[in-house]
């Protein structure tokens, strides 16, 4: 997914785990696959800057070459810069790796805006702050790109964690996580805790800040509070889920639930914003405007373009409503809801106004490719990608930004009938019509 808002981040910031830790509730969920409990070596292994994505340090080749790699659950290729580029401090030098193998095949990935292309090969890959294993994985060596790398983002490649169906050039190219699980005893599960800053960071702070955790092979209890609620993965391509209801400050948008998933709903760490289908976006903005009507904001703010600024420390969080998405549960006719605060959907932007001001962008935007639950959503929650059991779990993140009056929430169960009808069935065509763009 390309941030930006498919980033490459398509619009999340890395900050130190902030906010109050909430008291833990007893775990009620059934037994999880994978090691449980403490993955101390993987905690805080992500960094990033607002709107530019979360990245993990990886090594490729022999001897190992260290690169920062964007963590992207909205795509399925492991692709790294492999040629000089003005925005890259370093890149993968295949000629220096004794274990590189050329697959003699090219790959071309166009986005709605921009593209990258490269040459396919395999090499040895490891994650220093991850499991203590080395695997041979497919690597797309990016030789040419346009509007893909981001100046100052500090990452040099992308780790697509979704399924083979959306890999380029086709689904025969095994994604990294599949290779990892096949070649090791690591359970087929990973989890992400993305920690937004909640306030603008200057460049020094942003570069030094911790951005969150990618736990490979299981779940770390220290990263969430309360219990995990799971929604089925509808289809293994993107991490597709089904939204059955949307509320703004508890007020139902009252739309046909198919609209919420038109033409799909996905969980995408490589997109900055919460992106909503056109009709849903318009209804949601109308409702958010009504809820915050004691103040009026410029048209460009609701388009995600203009910034609104308040004197430092005076942002009126209370006038903005919470947004709740109800997700299909694991039990028939049962759903649960995830609720985010304005602290998640108003994204702090640094270096714009004076140091006396806090400035924000509205990080809910319109989509023509379905709902995208990007960093804006994920920064509120600990998100478990339980591939083994074809489900995604949500719990309140121990690092989400909140205030003394409201916190993000994951609550259930709720009785919801006919949830299967909420899924949209994309008409099948003979040709692939996959659009990679995630702006």
């Amino acid at each position: 997914t390309h941030l930006g808002i498919r980033l490459p981040l398509r619009s999340g910031l890395a900050g130190p785990p902030l906010g109050l830790r909430l008291p833990r509730e007893t775990d009620e969920e059934s037994e999880e696959p994978g090691r449980r409990g403490s993955f101390v070596e993987m905690v805080d292994n992500l960094r990033g800057k607002s709107g530019q994505g979360y990245y993990v340090e990886m090594t490729v080749g022999s001897p190992p070459q260290t690169l920062n790699i964007l963590v992207d659950t909205g795509s399925s290729n492991f692709a790294v810069g492999a040629a000089p580029h003005p925005f890259l401090h370093r890149y993968y030098q295949r000629q220096l790796s004794s274990t590189y193998r050329d697959l003699r095949k090219g790959v071309y990935v166009p986005y709605t805006q921009g593209k990258w292309e490269g040459e396919l090969g395999t090499d040895l890959v490891s994650i220093p702050h991850g499991p203590n294993v080395t695997v041979r994985a497919n690597i797309a060596a990016i030789t040419e790109s346009d509007k893909f790398f981001i100046n100052g983002s500090n990452w040099e490649g992308i780790l697509g964690l979704a399924y083979a169906e959306i890999a380029r050039p086709d689904d025969s190219l095994e994604p990294f996580f599949d290779s990892l699980v096949k070649q090791t005893h690591i359970p087929n599960i990973f989890s992400l805790q993305l920690c937004g800053a909640g306030f603008p960071l200057n460049q020094t702070e942003a570069l030094a800040s911790v951005g969150g955790s990618m736990i490979i092979g299981g779940i770390d209890h220290s990263l969430y509070t309360g219990r995990l609620w799971y929604t089925p993965i509808r289809r293994e391509w993107y991490y597709e889920v089904i939204i059955v209801r949307v509320e703004i400050n508890g007020q139902d948008l009252k739309m046909d639930c198919k609209e919420y998933n038109y033409d799909k709903s996905i969980v995408d760490s490589g997109t900055t914003n919460l992106r909503l289908p056109k009709k849903v976006f318009e209804a949601a903005v109308k409702s958010i405007k009504a809820a915050s009507s004691t103040e009026k904001f410029p048209d460009g703010f609701w388009l995600g373009e203009q910034l609104v600024c308040w004197q430092a420390g005076t942002t009126p969080w209370n006038i903005f409503p919470v947004i709740s998405l109800y997700l299909m549960g694991e039990v028939t006719n049962q759903s649960f809801r995830i609720t985010i605060l304005p602290q998640q959907y108003l994204r702090p932007v640094e270096d714009v106004a004076t140091s006396q001001d806090d400035c924000y962008k509205f990080a809910v935007s319109q989509s023509s490719t379905g709902t995208v639950m990007g960093a804006v959503i994920m920064e509120g929650f600990y998100v478990v990608f339980d591939r083994a059991r074809k489900r995604i779990g949500f719990a309140v993140s121990a690092c989400h930004v909140h205030d003394e009056f409201r916190t993000a929430a994951v609550e259930g169960p709720f009785v919801t009938a006919d949830m299967e009808d909420c899924g949209y069935n994309i008409p099948q065509t003979d040709e692939s019509t996959l659009m990679t763009g995630r702006a």
């Epitope: 004691t294 410029p298 460009g300 609104v308």
Partner: antibody, heavy 120, light 108 residues
Framework: QLQLQESGPGLVKPSETLSLTCTVS??????????WGWIRQPPGKGLEWIGS???????YYNPSLKSRVTISVDTSKNQFSLKLSSVTAADTAVYYC????????????WGRGTLVTVSS | EIVLTQSPATLSLSPGERATLSCRAS??????LAWYQQKPGQAPRLLIY???KRATGIPARFSGSGSGTDFTLTISSLEPEDFAVYYC??????????FGGGTKVEIK
């Protein structure tokens, strides 16, 4: 058509409070489509935004003046007002009231302005 | 803070000539920029908003262009009433607060 007219004393003593009122005629100040603002211009100098207000009473102030500024609205009289406390000679300026339109972003309609001199 | 720098400070031209005024932002303001005209003893008047849209009643000889950090106000053929001071203003950050220092267009 809508018009704005500033009124208030043209001379204020140092350390006192400058008070101005802007009367909106030909339209309602309670329109949800606009903010209302104050801008000033010292003699021979450029424009400085002072602050803006919505009919609900929600205000925004220039950080450099915030500690001294109060802007209020009286929808029954179709007026909004400016108070600037502890004035000095540096506050001598032409004070304009204006409507913030075009997507609540630009000053699309201005009053004629009133010169306020701070002097003992 | 976003700073707007206008150049030149003064532009000396004759009626009928083309005037090109520049406004440069210290960082991108997208297309959220306006131009105002102020004649002596009068209030400013909105000429251009959103970088290139003419406000109501503004003659076609006034045009705006640019996006990001560099913007231009062009007066295709100066009329006697166009000699005035011109200000740019950014509203990328809201509320609208930042004006440029102004460019005076005077008769040569």
């Amino acid at each position: 058509q809508l018009q704005l007219q500033e009124s208030g004393p043209g001379l204020v003593k140092p350390s006192e409070t400058l008070s101005l009122t802007c009367t909106v005629s030909g339209g309602s100040i309670s329109s949800s489509s606009y903010y209302w603002g104050w801008i000033r211009q010292p003699p021979g100098k450029g424009l400085e935004w002072i602050g803006s207000i919505y009919y609900s009473g929600s205000t925004y102030y220039n950080p450099s003046l915030k500690s001294r500024v109060t802007i209020s609205v009286d929808t029954s009289k179709n007026q909004f007002s400016l108070k600037l406390s502890s004035v000095t000679a540096a506050d001598t300026a032409v004070y304009y009231c204006a409507r913030v339109g075009h997507g609540i972003s630009y000053f699309d309609l201005w009053g004629r302005g009133t010169l306020v001199t701070v002097s003992s | 803070e976003i700073v707007l720098t206008q150049s030149p400070a003064t532009l000396s031209l004759s009626p009928g000539e083309r005037a090109t005024l520049s406004c440069r932002a210290s960082q991108s303001v997208s297309s959220y920029l306006a131009w105002y005209q102020q004649k002596p003893g009068q209030a400013p008047r909105l000429l251009i908003y959103d970088a290139s849209k003419r406000a109501t009643g503004i003659p076609a000889r006034f045009s705006g262009s640019g996006s990001g950090t560099d913007f231009t106000l062009t007066i295709s053929s100066l009329e006697p009433e166009d000699f005035a001071v011109y200000y740019c203003q950014q509203v990328y950050t809201w509320p609208p607060r930042t004006f440029g220092g102004g460019t005076k267009v005077e008769i040569k």
